[in-house]
């Protein structure tokens, strides 16, 4: 069957894709096209009620800082 | 510290198959986590597969079906048996893992390169 993602598990999955960038456990606000009165998403619905691929579990990783210029 | 040995890594022609293998050694005790990732030539270093300490496994879209990741968490070791390959795998295949007891620290292998020609 579908393989899941659920709990420690899932940390550290969203641990080791993110990395340093550190990671949400629901998407940011307006993030995507959702509309104000769809419910918001969070990883445990989509990789833990249901299996999820690896491009899903990178949607929740947090943006990448700007390299600081001098 | 941890250190990562990939091998069998080559060259194949299309719709061959190859078995690659990552051993890790040194500080091993928490290894949660698990990956191959892949870079080709002037692209930027893609995720292909993860498994986690109890064998959940994750895949690239662009993988999924051809390629199978293993672990045998006795021999720290990580597989990652790729079939159906295709030109556009081409690729320095990297391991990595992630150290729990560090705060998430990744360790990178330094690569195997796989060749698939048509």
């Known amino acids: 069957g579908p393989e899941t993602l659920c709990g420690a598990e899932l940390v550290d999955a969203l641990q080791f894709v993110c990395g340093d960038r550190g990671f949400y456990f629901n998407k940011p606000t307006g993030y995507g096209s959702s509309s104000r009165r769809a419910p918001q998403t969070g990883i445990v619905d989509e990789c833990c009620f249901r299996s999820c691929d690896l491009r899903r579990l990178e949607m929740y990783c947090a943006p990448l800082k700007p390299a600081k210029s001098a | 510290q941890v250190q990562l040995q990939e091998s069998g890594g080559g060259l194949v022609q299309a719709g061959g198959s190859l078995r690659l293998s990552c051993a890790a050694s040194g500080n091993i005790f928490d290894l949660p986590y698990m990956g191959w990732y892949r870079q080709a030539p002037g692209k930027e270093r893609e995720l292909v597969a993860t498994i986690s300490i109890g064998s959940t496994t994750n895949y690239a879209d662009s993988v999924k079906g051809r390629f199978t990741i293993s672990r045998d968490n006795a021999k720290n070791t990580v597989y990652l048996q790729m079939n159906s390959l295709k030109p556009e795998d081409t690729a320095v295949y990297y391991c990595?893992?992630?150290?729990?007891?560090?705060?998430?620290?990744?360790?990178w292998g330094q690569g195997t390169q796989v060749t698939v020609s048509s």
């Open positions: 990595a893992v992630v150290h729990r007891s560090t705060g998430g620290y990744k360790y």
